[in-house]
């Protein structure tokens, strides 16, 4: 009686269970009676990464420079390549199709987390004690003058974007 | 039956052309690369080309016979073609179309063409 | 373009010799396995022998043996018989963008 089920790593086809093609491989001929499925390397451009029944090998995917993408790890007969952003830039979807620049953080806020080529800038504000006054996707929040350590007193209070402002101390005459 | 039948060999003369039919049964059309091979009288065997599974079709050709032969199929009439054009003394051969692409694990019994003025 | 060269291009044995016909490729076939022996008497289709250079389909009997890898294959029949006698082909296929298959010229097995 003919198979109605076949086993992992096969397919049904004329009622009799055909071996799956390995991965890197794709389906030339099916399996006969007589003889195992035929299955041929996928050429060097092209990947397959399961087991499979496909006539076709899927293209590697092209890390496009002019959207300011490049390659990560090539890919292989049995892995898609995998394109990352130049310097400066991250991707803008999981699956990185284009590249945009990173964020800066505005005063008043400073970086959390630097950038990637997956991910963007993340922004904190600054903490009371913590001042930032410029735009940048490197610098962290950075800590207030002390004014006591300099034997100095603070003459205007610091702010998120501003370091406090330290002066002489008044002497008594 | 698993088989493969061609037809439309015949006498022809040079510079025409010819059609030649292979019509499967027995299996998933579809999903089978299909090829033809030639075989002039009294010599060896001689790949003229193949056409791959898959709805685009992809198609490989000896290099003598790339410009001249075509390799098409048609799924709904699971039927494979060779149009043969500009033909020479030299294709005279009996022509089998055969399952599979780089072993072959089905053949016609073959259709003669003699290409002769 | 691949090209096979096959040898001896005919030879006479006995039945019950042993008899190995080589099978030399220009190039490496694909994946190193891609070479099919087949067997053609006169009047008739051939007929698929090995494959994956070693791989007998079922029914093919167990006399008949494929070794090689790359450029170099061999075809032995161990104990030869009388239905035995017919040209054999080797056919490499090197890939699916430069001129997929060749045969060889053939060896034809003759009674001695």
């Known amino acids: 009686e003919p198979p109605t089920a076949c086993r992992e790593k096969q397919y049904l086809i004329n009622s009799q269970c055909c071996s799956l093609c390995q991965p890197g491989q794709k389906l030339v001929s099916d399996c006969t009676e007589f003889t195992e499925t035929e299955c041929l390397p996928c050429s060097e451009s092209e990947f397959l990464d399961t087991w499979n029944r496909e006539t076709r090998c899927h293209q590697h995917k092209y890390c496009d420079p002019n959207l300011g993408l490049q390659v990560q790890q090539k890919g292989t007969s049995e892995t898609d390549t995998i394109c990352t952003c130049e310097e400066g830039l991250h991707c803008t979807s999981e699956s990185c199709e284009s590249c945009v620049p990173h964020r800066s953080c505005l005063p008043g806020f400073g970086v959390k987390q630097i950038a990637t080529g997956v991910s963007d800038t993340i922004c904190e504000p600054c903490p009371v004690g913590f001042f930032s006054n410029v735009s940048s996707a490197f610098e962290k929040c950075r800590p207030w003058t002390s004014c006591e350590t300099k034997d100095l007193v603070v003459q205007q209070a610091g702010t998120n974007k501003t370091d406090v402002v330290c002066g002489p101390q008044d002497r008594q005459r | 039956e698993v088989q493969l039948e061609e037809s439309g060999g015949g006498l022809v003369q040079p510079g025409g052309s010819l059609r030649l039919s292979c019509a499967a049964s027995g299996f998933d059309f579809s999903s089978n690369a299909m090829s033809w091979v030639r075989q002039a009288p009294g010599k060896g065997l001689e790949w003229v080309g193949t056409i791959y599974a898959g709805s685009n079709g992809n198609t490989d050709y000896a290099s003598w016979a790339k410009g001249r032969f075509t390799i098409s199929k048609d799924t709904s009439k699971t039927t494979l073609y060779l149009q043969m054009n500009s033909l020479r003394a030299e294709d005279t051969a009996t022509y089998f179309c055969?399952?599979?692409?780089?072993?072959?694990?089905?053949w016609g019994q073959g259709t003669l063409v003699t290409v002769s003025s | 373009d691949i090209v096979m060269t096959q040898s001896p291009s005919s030879l006479s044995a006995s039945v019950g010799d042993r008899v190995t016909i080589t099978c030399q490729a220009s190039e490496s076939v694909v994946s190193n396995n891609r070479l099919a022996w087949y067997q053609q008497k006169p009047g008739q289709a051939p007929k698929l022998l090995i494959y994956?250079?070693?791989t007998l389909p079922s029914g093919v009997p167990s006399r008949f043996s494929g070794s090689g890898s790359g450029t170099d294959f061999t075809l032995t029949i161990s104990s030869l018989q009388p239905e035995d006698f017919a040209t054999y082909y080797c056919a490499g296929y090197k890939s699916s963008s430069t001129d997929g298959t060749a045969f060889g010229q053939g060896t034809k097995v003759v009674i001695k």
């Open positions: 055969a399952r599979g692409a780089s072993y072959f694990t089905l």
């Open positions: 994956l250079a070693s």
